[in-house]
C-alpha cells in the first residue's frame, strides 16, 4: 500500500455567517495522526505513536499549516452564494500519496453539507464535478472564486501538493513509521448459533501495518470464501488496526478448526477454545 497523508478540514456557517473556528484532522497511512485543538489553537498529535513520529520536535509547523488552510477554507465558504438559513458546512479533503515505485498522487475534494461537489487531480489539474445540478452550481461558484487569479491558483495547488509530499516524506523519515511493526493480538471466541451449530469468531487487534491475512482452516485447509464472513480492517484509535473473521461450524467438530493469521512475514494458528474465550498474543 502507498504511504499517504490525508487532511480533512471543515468550516461552518450559521445563517450565512461563517464561523470563526474550524475542525481539522490529519491521517498518516490511514491512521488518525493530528487534530486541531480549537481551545488551544494548536495541532495536537493523536496518541503516543503520533508523538513518537516527530520525537521531541514541536508541532509549530503543523499548527501554522492547519491554521492557514482553515483560513483559506473559511474564505471559500464565504463566497458560496445562496446559503440558506441554519447550519451549513464546507469540507475539504486533501490527500497526497507516495507509491512503492516513488511515483506520487495528489487529490483534493470539496463537500458542501456532506455532499461531494468538486474534485481535483492535482497532477493533471483535472477537475471533476458530479452530475447533480446542486453540485454543478456549487462547483461553478467555488471555481469562480478560486480562479480570480488563475496563475496564483495553479501555483497555489502545486505548492500545496509539494508541501503535502514534503511533510509526508518528513514523517516517513521517522523509523517509527517506516519500520513500525506491531504484531496482532489474536483471540478466538465461540457463540451458540442454531441448534447443533456454533459460530466461531477470530479477532485480530492492535496490529500495524494494515495488511493482514486472517482465515479459518478446517483440518489445516483454508475454508472457501463463501463459508466465511470478514470484517473490514479498521483503525482502532491507537495507531493500529483491527479486523475479524467468522464461520459457522458443527458442535463437536471444534478440534478440526483453527484460525490462521499472517502479518508482516510472521504467522500463527489459533484453536477454537473449549470454553468461552481464549486470548493469545503472538510472540515473535
Amino acid at each position: 500500500e502507498p504511504h499517504s497523508l490525508r487532511y480533512n478540514l471543515t468550516v461552518l456557517s450559521w445563517d450565512g455567517s461563517v464561523q470563526s473556528g474550524f475542525l481539522a484532522e490529519v491521517h498518516l497511512d490511514g491512521q488518525p495522526f493530528l487534530r486541531y485543538d480549537r481551545q488551544k489553537c494548536r495541532a495536537k498529535p493523536q496518541g503516543q505513536w503520533a508523538e513518537d513520529v516527530l520525537g521531541n520536535k514541536t508541532w509549530d509547523r503543523e499548527t501554522r499549516d492547519l491554521t492557514g488552510n482553515g483560513k483559506d477554507l473559511r474564505m471559500t465558504l464565504a463566497h458560496i452564494k445562496d446559503q440558506k438559513e441554519g447550519l451549513h458546512s464546507l469540507q475539504e479533503i486533501r490527500v497526497c500519496e507516495i507509491h512503492e515505485d516513488n511515483s506520487t498522487r495528489s487529490s483534493q475534494h470539496f463537500y458542501y453539507d456532506g455532499e461531494l461537489f468538486l474534485s481535483q487531480n492535482v497532477e493533471t489539474e483535472e477537475w471533476t464535478v458530479p452530475q447533480s445540478s446542486r453540485a454543478q452550481t456549487l462547483a461553478m461558484n467555488v471555481r469562480n472564486f478560486l480562479k480570480e487569479d488563475a496563475m496564483k491558483t495553479k501555483t497555489h495547488y502545486h505548492a500545496m501538493h509539494a508541501d503535502c509530499l514534503q511533510e509526508l516524506r518528513r514523517y516517513l523519515e521517522s523509523s517509527v513509521v517506516l519500520r513500525r511493526r506491531v504484531p496482532p493480538m489474536v483471540n478466538v471466541t465461540r457463540s451458540e448459533a442454531s441448534e447443533g451449530n456454533i459460530t466461531v469468531t477470530c479477532r485480530a487487534s492492535s496490529f500495524y501495518p494494515r495488511n493482514i491475512t486472517l482465515t479459518w482452516r478446517q483440518d489445516g485447509v483454508s475454508l472457501s470464501h463463501d463459508t466465511q464472513q470478514w470484517g473490514d480492517v479498521l483503525p482502532d484509535g491507537n495507531g493500529t488496526y483491527q479486523t475479524w473473521v467468522a464461520t459457522r461450524i458443527c458442535q463437536g467438530e471444534e478440534q478440526r478448526f483453527t484460525c490462521y493469521m499472517e502479518h508482516s512475514g510472521n504467522h500463527s494458528t489459533h484453536p477454537v477454545p473449549s470454553g468461552k474465550v481464549l486470548v493469545l498474543q503472538s510472540h515473535w
Partner: antibody
Amino acid sequence: QVQLVQSGAEVKKPGASVKVSCKASGYAFTKYNFYWVRQAPGQGLEWIGYIDPYFGGTVYNQKFKGKATLTVDKSTSTAYMELRSLRSDDTAVYYCATTDAYSLFTYWGQGTLVTVSS
Amino acid sequence: DIQMTQSPSSLSASVGDRVTITCRASQDISNYLNWYQQTPGKAVKLLIYYTSRLHSGVPSRFSGSGSGTDYTLTISSLQPEDIATYFCLQGNTLPFTFGQGTKLEIK
C-alpha cells in the same frame, strides 16, 4: 520447493516402540499441518492423525488413539510419529504428508517401512 | 466411517486411450475428494483436489468430476509415464478414508 524426507526403515520386536521422523524444507515449517498415513502390505492407505506444528494441536483417527503419538520439533523443522506396543499387524509403510492450505495431503514423504517381527 | 469403493481395482489400456477410474462414497462427501498417483520408488503425487481442481504442475490430460457420492478421474490420452496406482481420498468427514487403489498398466 517443498520436500519431506523421512527416516530409514526400522525392524522392531513385538511390544517395542518406534519413532519415525519427517524433516521438512522449502517452506515455513509451522505454517502447515502434518498428516500421517500408513499402508500395510497389499492393503489400502489408512489415515493415522495430524498435528498443527504451530501450537502442537493433534487430531487422531480413533483407531490409532493410544497407538500413535504425533509431535514436532520446530528447531529442526521435523515432525515425528511414535508408535508403541508394536504388533506384527503394524508392519507397514508409514508416510508423512503436508498441505499448501488448499488441499489435504498435498506433498508426501518417501515413506518409512516399519517391520514388526519376532 | 465413510467407505470409499474404487473401481476397477486394475485396468490395462493402450497409449492414447481415454481412461476412467471411479470412486463411490458410502455417503455424501460434498465434493471433498482428492485423487493421487503412486509410482514405485517415487513420492505419492496429488493430482486433483476438491473433485475437479488440478494441482499445479499436473498435466491437463488429468481431470476430475462428480458430486454427492460418485466421483471420476479421467486421463484423456494415456501416456507411458502414467503407469501407476491411483487412489482417491475423502476429506469431508473424520476419519479421512482412502479408496483401495486402481493399478493402471499399459497393454
